[in-house]
Structures are given as structure tokens and as C-alpha cells.
């Protein structure tokens, strides 16, 4: 067991690394290192991560497991996948809600909150793109409704109501005076 600067481990298999005195086999994912091996090429003493902790990778040096993240209820997050010994909790948004990133350069680990998806039907519009990673994309007004300002207005049910040009085009009425 030669020098002290990361010597090559002459052990069968490649998952050995010098930990102190000896080249030891590391711990599998989901296990932490309780004690290194006590003879060359030996097995380290590895213990399963306790509940609510995890280690996602094989390792030689982690003497404790990482604490599982808790989904942020204040941000309306829910657990899409519960934490296991080998994987952290996967937080996301419940159906009908979408992820709004809290930073401009958004990556998977970025902080986020959940926003309720726009209900196109309630706005009397077609759903052009269903809400998942971003908000719902609403399209044109539903049949029986016409564009008026920012919203969709119901076609008049009688000739007594006013029907501007756009209304007439959609609803089939002539403008009444």
C-alpha cells in the first residue's frame, strides 16, 4: 500500500479508492460510509441511508446521507416522487398548475413556485396549448363569442342588442341601429 497521493489501487474491479491506509471498495448508492476497509482491497462498512435521507451515487467518502428536500407548500409545490434512499424528492406542481421559475436562467434545480393554469374555457376561448411546463395558451373565442377588447363577448341572442362589425362577422348579425 504505497505512497500517499492517490496511488493506483491494484484491486480487482475498478470501484476501489485509497481511503486512508487502504484501497477500499466504495459504498453503493443509497448507502453511506460508516468505516473504511481495514485491509487492502477490502469492503468498506456501508450502511443504508436512514429514512428521509439519500445518496444518489456510489461513493467512497460520504459519511452521512443528504437530507431529502421538502417541497415548499408556500409555493404550492407537491411531491411528484417521494424521496428514496437513492433519489431526492421530486417536487413539482399539481395538475392544473404550472411551474413559474424564480430566476431568469431557469434550470431543473432553480427555485420555483406553482401558478394556477389559465382556464381558457372560463375565458370563452379555445385551448391552443395545454398547461404543463408553462401557462395555458388560449386561442380564439369559442363559437358563439366574439373578440371585444381583451375578452370574448357572447353573441347577442336577439336583434335588439347592438352588434358591432366584429360581432356581425362572427355572430352572423348585421349591425342594428
Amino acid at each position: 500500500q504505497g505512497g500517499t497521493r492517490s496511488p493506483r489501487c491494484d484491486c480487482a474491479g475498478d470501484f476501489h479508492k485509497k481511503i486512508g491506509l487502504f484501497c477500499c471498495r466504495g459504498c453503493p448508492a443509497g448507502h453511506y460510509l460508516k468505516a473504511p476497509c481495514t485491509e487492502p482491497c477490502g469492503n468498506s462498512t456501508c450502511l443504508v441511508c436512514p429514512q428521509d435521507t439519500f445518496l444518489a451515487w456510489e461513493n467512497h467518502h460520504n459519511s452521512e446521507c443528504a437530507r431529502c428536500q421538502a417541497c415548499d407548500e408556500q409555493a404550492s409545490q407537491v411531491a411528484l416522487e417521494n424521496c428514496s434512499a437513492v433519489a431526492d424528492t421530486r417536487c413539482g406542481c399539481k395538475p392544473g398548475w404550472f411551474v413559474e421559475c424564480q430566476v431568469s436562467q431557469c434550470v431543473s434545480s432553480s427555485p420555483f413556485y406553482c401558478q394556477p393554469c389559465l382556464d381558457c374555457g372560463a375565458l370563452h376561448r379555445h385551448t391552443r396549448l395545454l398547461c404543463s411546463r408553462r401557462d395555458t395558451d388560449c386561442g380564439t373565442c369559442l363559437p358563439g363569442f366574439y373578440e371585444h377588447g381583451d375578452g370574448c363577448v357572447s353573441c347577442p341572442t336577439s336583434t335588439l342588442g347592438s352588434c358591432p362589425e366584429r360581432c356581425a362577422a362572427v355572430c352572423g348579425w348585421r349591425q342594428m341601429f
Epitope: T4, I19, G20, L21, F22, K34, C37, T38, E39, P40
Partner: antibody, heavy 120, light 107 residues
Framework: EVQLVESGGGLVKPGGSLRLSCAAS????????MSWIRQAPGKGLEWVSY????????NYADSVKGRFTISRDNAKNSLYLQMNSLRAEDTAVYYC??????????????WGQGTLVTVS | DIEMTQSPSSVSASVGDTVTITCRAS??????LAWYQQKPGQAPKFLIY???NLQSGVPSRFSGSGYGTDFTLTISGLQPEDFATYYC?????????FGGGTKVDIK
């Protein structure tokens, strides 16, 4: 209570032999590595030898290599040091030591009270 | 072999003082360093492992630090029972080696 008790020390002539024993109790002896460490009168600590839990690996200080042999009997919870061709400079208190509580291999968290070997 | 050099070899101090002992390794040993306390006629007592971790039951006035080649044992607020000799020991490679010891005595 975790305990190590050495025995077998005494006065021996240069060139003579002695066998030290260390009796372990209070822990699962067969699970842990063991070592002998010595201390010459009025001097510091000197590591002598190491043996793994299964006896498959041993290591010695250069000063004792070829003269001393470390061994263990897990069935008897005992560690041994066979010392041959003893020299005056081997005069020391000999401690057996192990590590039952710490994730640092090669450190020693339990020690015996020591047994004195005098070569004269 | 890795040589462990302790300094000072002795230090005189009073109860309540802070005492610092240094240990230097002749090669890089990461954090594979232990500290022991020994009183006359007694076996050494394990204090600190992996350079900075306090062994259970050891008073918190003892602390260790360092990485690589330079290490320190600090006793903050020396107590009467702390007057003893202190040894560092490397466990990075065989042969295991100890420092020469630092005797802490009463001023």
C-alpha cells in the same frame, strides 16, 4: 465494558523470545483490527504491528520486521505478539489497541493498560 | 515513512489558559490524523480523529483543525486534569507514526 488486558511481559535476555497476549472483552473482537504499540521508558509512542479482523493482512514497523509476528484467535478473543531475537532497544511497555467506535482506520480508541518487556 | 513533528516539545501553562499544539507531517496526509492524551503511568487516551472530530466523551474545550500537512490541537480553558503529554498520529499510510509528544505542565 470494553476492555483490553495485556499479559506476558517480563525480563528477558538479548536474543531471547517472549510471547505477549491481549485478552479482549466487551466488544465483538472478530469485527475489528488490532495493533501493538510500544513506549520505551521516558520516550514517545511507537507503532509496532497491525492485523486485520480476519488475520488476512498484517503489517510491521521496520524495526521489528522479521523478528516479531502478530496473530489473533477470534474464537478466544485474543491477540498475540511473538517476539524473537529480542534486543535492548525493544525494552518498552507494550500496549494492544484497537478502534471500535471511530471511522478512522489506523486510529486507536481503546488501549490496554500495557505490559512491560525488559531486555537486559 | 511519514515523519510527524510536534511543537513545542513542552509548554508551561496555567489553569484557564488556552494552549495550542502543532503537528506537521512530512507528506500530505489529508485529514488522517488523530490526537491522544497520556498521563504518567497510564495508557494514551483517544481525543480527536480525522483531524477535527471530537471523540465522544471528550470535553468540548479540546478542538482540532488542519488538513494536508499542518495540524493543530487547541485546549481552550485549561483544566487541572489536562496537564499531560499530547501525541499526534498519522493514519494515511504504513508505518503508522506518532509525533514526539508535547508535555503540558503547570507554570
Amino acid at each position: 465494558e470494553v476492555q483490553l488486558v495485556e499479559s506476558g511481559g517480563g525480563l528477558v535476555k538479548p536474543g531471547g523470545s517472549l510471547r505477549l497476549s491481549c485478552a479482549a472483552s466487551g466488544f465483538t473482537f472478530s469485527d475489528y483490527y488490532m495493533s501493538w504499540i510500544r513506549q520505551a521508558p521516558g520516550k514517545g509512542l511507537e507503532w509496532v504491528s497491525y492485523i486485520s479482523s480476519s488475520s488476512s493482512y498484517t503489517n510491521y514497523a521496520d524495526s521489528v520486521k522479521g523478528r516479531f509476528t502478530i496473530s489473533r484467535d477470534n474464537a478466544k478473543n485474543s491477540l498475540y505478539l511473538q517476539m524473537n531475537s529480542l534486543r535492548a532497544e525493544d525494552t518498552a511497555v507494550y500496549y494492544c489497541a484497537s478502534n471500535v467506535d471511530t471511522a478512522m482506520v489506523g486510529a486507536f480508541d481503546i488501549w490496554g493498560q500495557g505490559t512491560l518487556v525488559t531486555v537486559s | 515513512d511519514i515523519e510527524m513533528t510536534q511543537s513545542p516539545s513542552s509548554v508551561s501553562a496555567s489553569v484557564g489558559d488556552t494552549v495550542t499544539i502543532t503537528c506537521r507531517a512530512s507528506q500530505h496526509i489529508s485529514n488522517w490524523l488523530a490526537w491522544y492524551q497520556q498521563k504518567p503511568g497510564q495508557a494514551p487516551k483517544f481525543l480527536i480523529y480525522t483531524a477535527s472530530n471530537l471523540q465522544s466523551g471528550v470535553p468540548s474545550r479540546f478542538s482540532g483543525s488542519g488538513y494536508g500537512t499542518d495540524f493543530t490541537l487547541t485546549i481552550s480553558g485549561l483544566q487541572p486534569e489536562d496537564f499531560a503529554t499530547y501525541y499526534c498520529q498519522q493514519a494515511d499510510s504504513f508505518p503508522l507514526t506518532f509525533g514526539g509528544g508535547t508535555k503540558v505542565d503547570i507554570k
